[in-house]
């Protein structure tokens, strides 16, 4: 704020007074000054800042005939409807030559019924959970004493005797209303009524009960919900192998989640149609007639690996003397995990079955015992993952190879034992 210098005497012979009244009051602040020569423009300051749009009038009257004689200047600032924004310290400011002069200050304040600076706000709280409400009122006149009311019932014997600016509520079991009365010498003002809606507490102990490659069974412990029974719980699952990563407190999942509703009790749900061997994050919230609880933190879970759902494809087996050449292609059906390799079994009509682990190769040459006179030799192949073997192929008979003939190819016709995999939501 500009400061008057002491080098020359201040021209002010009258300073702004004080105005204190109720909202809506009209009043006038005045500054009076006596200057020699050309009268200056009088500016008004509020709390040190020039009021650019002040409703002010300036009257100036010469005290003599000569322009260089003294002038009396009166500046009047009108406050038409006193508001909180009008309150503060007022001063006049004039520039005379190279100097700035500021009048002594006057003050504008409010006096009347208490005025609320802060009122209780609507909010939701979990059942039986402590919270605070705020209420702040000012005069003048001071003091202002507060009285809190819950469901229109006073929480203290008299204003000022109970909690004041902050009301600590240890917990609620039903939706309630709170208001605050402000009392001063002029009377009473009542705040807005805040509705505090009691929601269920966040469920606890969300955990896995059982895991299947395409489904997870989860359970949780419900939180308290006050006098309002839980109507249902909602479980969300989202893929978390996209590299985005869900932080514990992240408000929203990166993708549209799979959402399922569970009737309660029991507080358990089977979540199906999932990808095998896939990381997910899951969370749960429970709802009463008053609304939903907050979500639990995201819990990382993973579906286990499954066995391949189908046998290898396009198996061909040809015999040339004491050697048999077998090759195949990867199963078309979902592997439900990481393919670790193939197992091959061959068997003659009257000979025991021979089982081999081929690894990840898709062909093998078999050295047959003896002169190759074993009759009706058949070959089966299965793919396997860490979870175990997938279904074996149908037995493929060993064909004798004739030069100039194309090797026979046996198409599998047997359907997989489980239904074809579908992705209804992915």
């Amino acid at each position: 704020a500009p400061r008057g210098t002491q080098a020359e005497e201040s021209p002010f012979v009258g300073n702004p007074g004080n105005i204190t009244g109720a909202r809506g009051l009209t009043g006038t602040l005045r500054c009076q000054l006596q200057v020699q020569g050309e009268p200056p423009e009088v500016h008004w300051l509020r709390d040190g800042q020039i009021l650019e749009l002040a409703d002010s009038t300036q009257t100036q009257v010469p005290l003599g005939e000569d322009e260089q004689d003294d002038w009396i200047v009166v500046s009047q600032l009108r406050i038409t409807s006193l508001q909180l924004s009008d309150t503060g310290q007022y001063q006049c400011l004039v520039f005379l030559g190279h100097q700035t002069f500021v009048s002594q200050p006057g003050y504008v304040g409010l006096e009347g019924l208490p005025y609320f600076l802060e009122e209780p706000e609507d909010r939701t709280v979990a059942a039986n959970t402590p919270f605070n409400l705020s209420c702040q009122a000012q005069g003048p006149p001071e003091p202002v004493d507060l009285l809190w009311l819950q469901d229109a019932v006073p929480l203290a014997t008299a204003p000022g005797h109970g909690p004041q600016r902050s009301l600590h509520v240890p917990g609620l079991n039903k939706t309630s209303s709170f208001s605050c009365e402000a009392h001063n010498a002029k009377g009473v003002t009542t705040s807005r009524t805040a509705t505090i809606t009691v929601l269920p507490q966040q469920p606890r102990n969300l955990h896995l009960v059982s895991r299947q490659p395409t489904e997870l069974e989860v359970a949780w412990t419900p939180g308290l919900s006050g006098i309002y029974p839980l109507t249902h719980c909602t479980l969300q699952a989202v893929l978390s192998d996209d590299g985005m990563g869900i932080q514990a407190g992240e408000p929203d999942p990166p993708e549209e989640p799979l959402t399922s509703q569970a009737s309660v009790p029991p507080h358990q749900l089977r979540l199906g149609s999932l990808h095998p061997h896939t990381p997910y994050h899951i969370r749960v919230a429970c709802t009463s007639s008053q609304g939903p609880s907050s979500w639990t933190h995201w819990l990382p879970v993973e579906t286990p690996e499954g066995v391949p759902l189908g046998p290898p494809e396009n198996i061909s087996a040809t015999r040339n003397g004491s050697q048999a050449f077998v090759h195949w292609q990867e199963p078309r059906a979902p592997l439900q995990g990481t393919l670790l390799g193939y197992r091959l079994a061959y068997q003659g009509q009257d000979t025991p079955e021979v089982l081999m682990d081929i690894g990840l190769r898709q062909e093998v040459t078999l050295e047959l015992q003896g002169d190759g006179s074993v009759s009706n030799l058949t070959v089966c192949v299965a793919a396997y993952t860490a979870a175990g073997d997938g279904p074996w192929s149908l037995p493929v008979p060993l064909e004798a190879w004739r030069p100039g003939q194309a090797q026979p190819v046996h198409q599998l016709v047997k359907e997989p034992s489980t239904p074809a995999f579908s992705w209804p939501w992915w």
Partner: antibody
């Protein structure tokens, strides 16, 4: 509490000079102005002049200029009115009065008065 | 110099009466009018300044109004303590001038 205490009554001969004092307590002496007003017996109020103790600046009623001197001693928070060439018509109660913060020429606190009799 | 013409010079009234005293300035004094009450043997006492602002401790039955050159002091309900002489004064510019006074007497 603001108090203005004036010197005691004076009886003077015509042509003499009188100097009366006004001691201020209870507020900052050089904040506003000190006015001098007189009131002849049974008559109205008449402004004599003023002084701004902060800088010693004075303003006089032209009617009395030349016979009146207003001064102040900041160190003892006292204002003075000196009147020379007294006439019988100068017999009056003389008041000092403090200028109001919001308009130094409106007078919010008054001394008890000093009666000057010229005869 | 500004002249202040006060009327009436005296009036008789009873306790509880509404009393009005007027003062006319010879030129516009921009609301710079004060009113004083003086009782016998006492110094004047400031009642109103800047036309309508009550001085500290002055009862609310005293009010000032007016604009430009015509100003009024009103006592809404006369009390026994209010019988005195009342003066107006312009505090706009030196030389400061007072009205001749209005004596309020018991009827």
């Amino acid at each position: 509490e603001v108090q203005l205490v004036q010197s005691g009554a004076e009886v003077k001969k015509p042509g003499a000079t009188v100097k009366i004092s006004c001691k201020v307590s209870g507020y900052s002496f050089w904040g506003a102005t000190m006015n001098w007003i007189r009131q002849p017996p049974g008559k109205g109020l008449e402004w004599i002049g003023l002084i701004k103790p902060s800088n010693g600046g004075t303003s006089y009623n032209q009617k009395f200029k030349g016979r009146v001197t207003i001064s102040a001693d900041k160190s003892i928070s006292t204002a003075y009115l000196q009147w020379s060439s007294l006439k019988a018509s100068d017999t009056a109660m003389y008041y000092c009065a403090h200028g109001h913060y919001e308009s130094y020429e409106a007078m919010d606190y008054w001394g008890q008065g000093t009666l000057v009799t010229v005869s | 110099d500004i002249q202040m013409t006060q009327s009436p010079s005296s009036l008789s009234a009873s306790v509880g009466d509404r009393v009005t005293i007027t003062c006319k300035a010879s030129q516009d004094v921009v609301s710079a009018v004060a009113w004083y009450q003086q009782k016998p043997g006492q110094a004047p006492r400031l009642l109103i300044y800047w036309q309508d602002t009550r001085h500290t401790g002055v009862p609310s039955r005293f009010s000032g109004s007016g604009s430009g050159t015509e100003f009024t002091l009103t006592i809404s309900s006369l009390q026994p303590d209010d019988f005195a002489t009342y003066y107006c004064q312009e505090h706009f510019s030196p030389p400061l001038t007072f009205g001749q006074g209005t004596k309020v007497e018991i009827k």
